[in-house]
């Protein structure tokens, strides 16, 4: 039970375009220390939607203060939906390397569906 | 304090539109914080979470009531609704809204409405 | 879906007396355990978060334990106003479910 899991509570999500999707996901220990990152879809193939280390989403917010000391929240909101964004969202916790940080767990993701802009 | 109400008809008939209304007063329900969520309970029995939304309009429903449920949000009221479709004489139940922690540990309902008997007959 | 156990279903104790109520998990759900008290026409209240933590306001004869499958709540001095309903929530993974309720009477 000590283990870090990673909770990604919502199986599924429903975000008319336009608007806002909000992806939970949290921690249950602060060990061991390294970035979360979030992809779409799983496997070789998957994107990269967020990086808690490096890099510019500019669609993508954290829904509380990543450097917060403590902080287990690693909740995201992605802006401005579009059909193109369905899929199966992962949170994924990876560990700190040299040189490269390993994945440690991952969520068991969030189905994103976009419903048409409401009329 | 945040205080929330439930609203709407007491009464459907077999096959119509469940209608509810959540108005939350004493703060806002755009807080990134929160989401907001609906519960039911059948008379005598026990809580069944039917779904929640997030203020930017971010959905999640209960898989076993989903084909039949809308929830929606409207910020400039500070209200957020619910719609079951298609109802039976199992939908009769007291009807919550509650708000919901939005962050771990844990996602509690926290606050809650005092609920709403909605009888489906004819 | 993860399914919550309660047991008992219903018991009787006398005011005073030391409660204690279970509520077991299909599966592992880390700390992520709530629990309500509902007295009859009134909406739940949050008496425990995260399988342990005492909601603001509510008095510390009410305690939490347990993660991963099992958990209990505790009410070390049974008073009058503890007479309920309560229930425990698991708010792992959606949908989030409910134990079936425990009814504390009065002996």
């Known amino acids: 039970e000590d283990e870090l899991q990673v909770i990604q509570p919502e199986k599924s999500v429903s975000v008319a375009a336009g608007e806002s999707a909000t992806l939970r996901c949290a921690m249950t220990s602060l060990i061991p220390v390294g970035p979360i990152m979030w992809f779409r879809g799983a496997g070789a193939g998957r994107e990269l939607i967020y990086n808690q280390k490096e890099g510019h989403f500019p669609r993508v917010t954290t829904v509380s203060e990543l450097t917060k000391r403590n902080n287990l929240d690693f909740s995201i909101s992605i802006s401005n939906i579009t059909p193109a964004d369905a899929g199966t969202y992962y949170c994924v916790k990876f560990r700190k390397g040299s040189p490269d940080d390993v994945e440690f767990k991952s969520g068991a993701g969030t189905e994103l569906s976009v419903r048409a802009k409401p009329s | 304090q945040l205080q929330l109400q439930e609203s709407g008809p007491g009464l459907v008939k077999p096959s119509e539109t469940l209608s509810l209304t959540c108005t939350v007063s004493?703060?806002?329900?755009?807080?990134?914080?929160?989401?907001w969520g609906w519960i039911r309970q059948p008379p005598g029995k026990g809580l069944e979470w039917i779904g929640s939304?997030?203020?930017?309009?971010?959905?999640y429903y209960n898989p076993s009531l989903k084909s039949r449920v809308t929830i929606s949000v409207d910020t400039s009221k500070n209200q957020f609704s619910l719609k079951l479709s298609s109802v039976t004489a199992a939908d009769t139940a007291v009807y919550y809204c509650?708000?919901?922690?939005?962050?771990?540990?844990?996602?509690?309902?926290?606050?809650w409405g005092q609920g709403t008997m909605v009888t489906v007959s004819s | 879906d993860i399914q919550m156990t309660q047991s008992p279903s219903s018991l009787s104790a006398s005011v005073g007396d030391r409660v204690t109520i279970t509520c077991r998990a299909s599966?592992?759900?880390?700390?992520?355990l709530n629990w309500y008290q509902q007295k009859p026409g009134k909406a739940p209240k949050l008496l425990i978060y995260?399988?342990?933590s005492l909601q603001s306001g509510v008095p510390s004869r009410f305690s939490g334990s347990g993660s991963g499958t099992d958990f209990t709540l505790t009410i070390s001095s049974l008073q009058p106003e503890d007479f309920a309903t309560y229930y425990c929530?698991?708010?792992?993974?959606?949908?989030?479910?409910f134990g079936g309720g425990t009814k504390v009477e009065i002996k």
């Open positions: 509650a708000r919901e922690v939005g962050a771990p540990p844990s996602y509690p309902f926290d606050i």
């Open positions: 004493g703060g806002s329900i755009s807080s990134n914080s929160y989401y």
């Open positions: 939304i997030y203020y930017s309009g971010s959905t």
């Open positions: 599966q592992s759900i880390s700390s992520y």
């Open positions: 995260a399988a342990s």
């Open positions: 929530q698991q708010a792992y993974s959606h949908p989030f479910t």
